[in-house]
Amino acid sequence: LIIGFGISGRHSITVTTVASAGNIGEDGILSCTFEPDIKLSDIVIQWLKEGVLGLVHEFKEGKDELSEQDEMFRGRTAVFADQVIVGNASLRLKNVQLTDAGTYKCYIITSKGKGNANLEYKTGAFSMPEVNVDYNASSETLRCEAPRWFPQPTVVWASQVDQGANFSEVSNTSFELNSENVTMKVVSVLYNVTINNTYSCMIENDIAKATGDIKVTESEIKRRSHLQLLNSKAS
């Protein structure tokens, strides 16, 4: 969480951003809030990016003002116009690109004053893993697949019964480049699996951590997965 202040005295307003990550090819949110102002027509929101000459986005007098927008963001940005009056200056970024990563500044002017805060935006690819029993294998085998990751993640297996055990000798992980030549499909196979145990496939890079769990018993198979972004720090 980054909290920025404007000029000292009564002309400063608090602006708060949250570092976040974008999943390339999907839409992302750059989060920014400020002390709300009841005078909508006086509110100005400017999003800037370090190293970019034009503006990322500008909102003033109740609407988008995109005449100064940089070419790389053309047609890809929007604020939540109906939320500006309650202090939400967050930016929606469509079709996130790898090159969107960097330091952004959320700069706010209201009738009460000015303020700004920086935001670190990381970009990459992350997806939920799915763990299945591989019935084609000669021994009891689990197969963990996740369709899109970048940068290349690490994959670690764990088990509820054998806590702390190192499964690197009995697992094999491969990375297959996807058709857009950036993201990769992750496939990890775990051999010599025992029944009545819960196994976890953990995939992690510097942006996200995802876990796929599978519980295999004689009568049923239960699956669960979740994904967590690693760098959601407020500023």
Epitope: K39, L40, E61, G62, I85, V86, S111
Partner: antibody, heavy 117, light 107 residues
Framework: QVQLVQSGAEVKKPGASVKVSCKVS????????MHWVRQAPGQGLEWMGA????????EYAQKFQGRVTLTADTSTSTAYMELSSLRSEDTAVYYC??????????WGQGTTVTVSS | DIQMTQSPSSLSASVGDRVTITCQAT??????LNWYQQKPGKPPKFLIY???QLAEGVPSRFSGSGSGTDYTLTISSLQSEDFATYYC?????????FGGGTKVEIK
Amino acid sequence: QVQLVQSGAEVKKPGASVKVSCKVSGYPFTSYWMHWVRQAPGQGLEWMGAIYPGKSDTEYAQKFQGRVTLTADTSTSTAYMELSSLRSEDTAVYYCTSTWTHYFDYWGQGTTVTVSS
Amino acid sequence: DIQMTQSPSSLSASVGDRVTITCQATQDIVKSLNWYQQKPGKPPKFLIYYTAQLAEGVPSRFSGSGSGTDYTLTISSLQSEDFATYYCLQFYEFPPTFGGGTKVEIK
């Protein structure tokens, strides 16, 4: 859930003052503007003013400037509206209303103020 | 101050009717307009925000549209519980101002 609970009805004499309270629960009181709107019998809605409790910033409608005072007690999440030099035309229902998710999204139940000699 | 002219001031309609209420601003309010419903003895109820977005729990028979200076609230098929007074509110320019209200009565 969000609730705005106002104080009870008041009967006042011309020239007196009235102070209406509005106790808030269910959202961060200090971080959002609280407004006051009044409605005379059989009439429309009229905005009076607003307060930002976190900084005690206030904004008033020109019509009420100098006669209305908005305050807030952040320890009890309560907003107050005081109207002085009352006259018969001030007989109305007074509402507090929040701007939490949107402008005037939640309303108090209203406080009837009757000004009569 | 921006003036909001609401019309009609009252109308009579039957259950099932399509009802349209308009609000005209004295200048462009850039879609910064909400609608409220009020029944006798009750506070206004938040209905539509930012011209066309339905507030939580509001039935889909209510809809809003408009831009610039002209805005409309439509009830596609009037129900008995919709008989009430409706107000528009502009919050683009300070101070916020309400329309005069439209009373929807049973024919």
